[in-house]
Interface confidence: low
């Protein structure tokens, strides 16, 4: 190899040992029969050398540094050449370094031809191995602007007082151009300006200078985003730290064309703007730090640019001003992440504060819009508390458990609407009366409607789930002893069409001791399946539930249990089942922890089934499934 550097080219070439690889045989640079491990070639020198091994790229790296002095004479602006040409260099991992020194009043601009640059964070690497490391200078201190790969959005970086650009090329890479040019600009009066150009949808992750270390004290850094006017941009902070400020406050400032409040100032902890149309600037301003304990300011953020959906121009009014104790959350539904670019999906409050989830509370009118490619990626969860504190006032009072139409009109699927129903302890109980009789969801007869009601105790210490119920069954009402939550859960988008089928009224009634009472009026056409609460986990200890089963005059009911024994083993107390004819009060009592369950029995009149649990041993729980079937009476037994 022969490297000749022209006189006054201000180029230095350094060949040195790189990161050692585990190779048994050492390798040397051979020059005039001498074996050396480092070679430095300065301007005006011509050196001929070889390597003592077949694969020098496993041992050595080459650095080519060009110092450009803009202090003492004119600056060589324009396209930057790779000197010496890569074809004249040995095939080693090579780093071209350009060190440009300029006056504080001179702005320097690096312009990157396509492909533009993409910033990478600590520990990341570029797929093709080609990296651009860019540094600036504040007085004598070097400041790292960032490390970049190809195929990104960064088109220009402006600095003043000097710039150091290092282009790293792997030994096998054929690139023979620098890919950038230098231009002079007037003073930018800040550390740097990074221009990021979006031609279509996409995202960019960017970082403050020196990231992940601290941003220089009391400095200002600006990012200029060039975004087509028909697209929308949203900013989200991925990671940030605040330093300990003695004077001034750390902040970000947005310059948004068309905004009447430019610049818009945000704290780093604030929700950042979204749904911005067209170009905008973002600036990070540091503060005067506490000398004793400065801390660090750092910021890593993402800009997401995407098409506005039809929805993003629509404002939805969610009027919760007449509601009390209610919160509505719009959030992403859980999905598996895909590896390809997925446009963001945001919900925006007042069109500007956008985030992936949003909670609206009662007492106000809220204006929301969406910035989302596919609104099925979001769903809504609502929680409303209806509580009674004074039993004298509430008794016999009724409330309709209906999803407000304002919520149904939103373009996002409702997932859960939960009513927390709270009563004064030992004073009142609750009754739920559906508009349409309910079916209990069982394995034998699952619900296939677009929604169900999930009824569970809302007493923190009590693990009691009454079950899942959907319209179209035989359960006329459900009475519960104390606080419960009723959740309307939707299972299909067709809920919007079926919304009229929802309707549940809750009334506060005099207190009763049983945990729950189900009133069942079977239809002649179908078999009614009923199961004890807390299926799969077992009826809680010492809990009693009843079913009031109506039998019409001309029918006979067949009561069938689906196993021979209950399976419960009592630690203390006894588990009982009482089947009682309502007309004659005649009753049969079964010891569930001892007796076999009754064979199918026929009932000509309305009857009760009451099940009371003991304190069971763990693993031997009480779970019962039974059915009621009506058939016409063949003989009049009255």
């Amino acid at each position: 190899f022969e490297i000749a550097l022209p006189r006054e080219s201000n180029i230095t070439v350094l060949i040195k040992l790189g990161t050692p690889t585990l190779l048994a045989k050492p390798c040397y640079i051979v020059i005039s029969k001498r074996h050396i491990t480092m070679l430095s070639i300065k301007s005006g020198e011509r050196i001929v050398f070889t390597f003592s091994c077949q694969s020098p790229e496993n041992h050595f790296v080459i650095e080519i540094q060009k110092n450009i002095d803009c202090m003492s004479g004119p600056c060589p602006f324009g396209e930057v050449q790779l000197q010496p040409s890569t074809s004249l260099l040995p095939t080693l991992n090579r780093t071209f370094i350009w060190d440009v020194k300029a006056h504080k009043s001179i702005g320097l601009e690096l312009q990157f031809s396509i492909p533009r640059l993409r910033q990478i964070g600590p520990g990341e690497s570029c797929p093709d191995g080609v990296t651009h490391s860019i540094s600036g200078r504040i007085d004598a201190t070097v400041v790292r602007i960032g490390t970049f790969c190809s195929n990104g959005t960064v088109s220009r970086i402006k600095m003043q007082e000097g710039v150091k650009m290092a282009l790293h090329l792997p030994w096998f890479h054929p690139r023979n151009v620098s890919g950038f040019s230098i231009a002079n600009r007037s003073s930018i009066k800040r550390l740097c300006i990074i221009e990021s150009v979006f031609e279509g949808e996409g995202s960019a992750t960017l970082m403050s200078a020196n990231y992940p270390e601290g941003f220089p004290e009391d400095e200002l850094m600006t990012w200029q985003f060039v975004v087509p006017a028909h697209l929308r941009a949203s900013v989200s902070f991925l990671n940030f730290n605040l330093s300990n400020c003695e004077r001034k406050e750390e902040r970000v400032e947005y310059y948004i064309p068309g905004s009447t409040t430019n610049p818009e100032v945000f704290k780093l902890e604030d929700k950042q703007p979204g749904n911005m149309a067209g170009n905008f600037n973002l600036s990070l301003q540091g503060c005067d730090q506490d000398a004793q304990s400065p801390g660090i300011l750092r910021l890593q953020f993402q800009v997401l640019v995407q098409h506005p959906q039809n929805e993003s121009n629509k404002i939805y009014v969610v009027d919760l001003s007449n509601e009390r104790a209610m919160s509505l959350t719009i959030e992403p539904r859980p999905v598996k992440q895909s590896r390809k670019f997925v446009p963001g999906c945001f919900v925006c409050l007042e069109s500007r504060t956008c985030s992936s989830n949003l909670t609206l509370t009662s007492g106000s009118k809220h204006k929301i819009s969406f910035l989302c490619d596919d609104l099925t990626r979001l769903w809504m969860n609502v929680e409303k508390t209806i509580s009674c504190t004074d039993h004298r006032y509430c008794q016999r009072k009724s409330y309709s458990l209906q999803v407000p139409s304002d919520i149904l009109h939103l373009p996002v699927e409702l997932h859960d609407f939960s009513w927390k129903l709270l009563v004064p302890k030992d004073r009142l109980s609750l009754v739920l009366v559906p508009a349409q009789k309910l079916q209990q969801h069982t394995h034998e007869k699952p619900c296939n409607t677009s929604f169900s009601y999930l009824v569970a105790s809302a007493i923190p210490s009590q693990d009691l789930y009454f079950g899942s119920f959907c319209p179209g069954g035989s359960i006329k009402q459900i009475q519960v002893k104390q606080n419960i939550s009723v959740t309307l859960r939707t299972f299909a988008p067709s809920f919007q069409q079926e919304a009229s089928r929802q309707g549940l009224t809750v009334s506060f009634i005099p207190y009763f001791k049983e945990e729950g009472v189900f009133t069942v009026t079977p239809d002649t056409k179908s078999k009614v399946y009923l199961r004890t609460p807390n299926w799969d986990r077992g009826l809680p200890s010492l809990t009693s539930v009843s079913w009031n089963i109506s039998v019409p005059r001309d029918q006979v009911a067949c009561l069938t249990f689906f196993k021979e024994r209950s399976g419960v083993v009592c630690q203390t107390g006894r588990a009982f089942m009482i089947i009682q004819e309502q007309r004659t009060r005649a009753e049969e009592i079964f010891s569930l922890d001892e007796d076999v369950l009754p064979k199918p029995s026929f009932h000509h009149h309305s009857f009760w089934v009451n099940i009371s649990n003991c304190s069971p041993t763990s693993g031997k729980q009480l779970d019962l499934l039974f059915s009621v079937t009506l058939t016409p009476r063949t003989v009049d037994l009255t």
Epitope: N244, K267, E269, D270, T329, T359, T361, N381, E383
Partner: antibody
Framework: EVQLVESGGGLVQPGGSLRLSCAAS????????IHWVRQAPGKGLEWVAS????????SYADSVKGRFTISADTSKNTAYLQMNSLRAEDTAVYYC?????????WGQGTLVTVSS | DIQMTQSPSSLSASVGDRVTITCRAS??????VAWYQQKPGKAPKLLIY???SLYSGVPSRFSGSRSGTDFTLTISSLQPEDFATYYC????????????FGQGTKVEIK
Amino acid sequence: EVQLVESGGGLVQPGGSLRLSCAASGFNLYSYYIHWVRQAPGKGLEWVASIYPYYSSTSYADSVKGRFTISADTSKNTAYLQMNSLRAEDTAVYYCARYYYAMDYWGQGTLVTVSS
Amino acid sequence: DIQMTQSPSSLSASVGDRVTITCRASQSVSSAVAWYQQKPGKAPKLLIYSASSLYSGVPSRFSGSRSGTDFTLTISSLQPEDFATYYCQQGYAGSWHPITFGQGTKVEIK
């Protein structure tokens, strides 16, 4: 240096009221969630209430809903817990804590005793 | 509300022992789970946030991990100053489910 200092605790009769203060220094109160957490003698920690002063959004544990009110005065960099209709079971050390990924800074606590 | 069931409620261990404390969430939760250490008469101190991130200034013998709805705090080699009560906590400020703490685990000297 980040610091939280609670005050306002003391002995109060059942049904009475108390107002606890949590004075913050070293950070802006309105940028963080502030929580009140209590600990009854010999018992574990129980979350009581939280406020995000920037949006004035509040939430409460079921056990104190309707009786306790959390608020903040950002000009004084102080959060408050107004406790009404106090019961014996409200007896505890009350801590205020700042939330940033977790409750990273806590006050020293103030003791509230509800007894006749 | 989401319950955090912490186990064991107490344990006896010796200096140098590896100690594991578990919290099980009653339903699926985000990774907004933190662990705190509390000594008698003192306020709790944050050890772990976001299920597995070590808070600054906390010795590296403390670590946190997650598996489904189970969250674990591990002390790799117990030191004399580690004898205290440890609490897990789920929920993040303003989340729909209120913040809840585990019942606590008292780590005592064997």
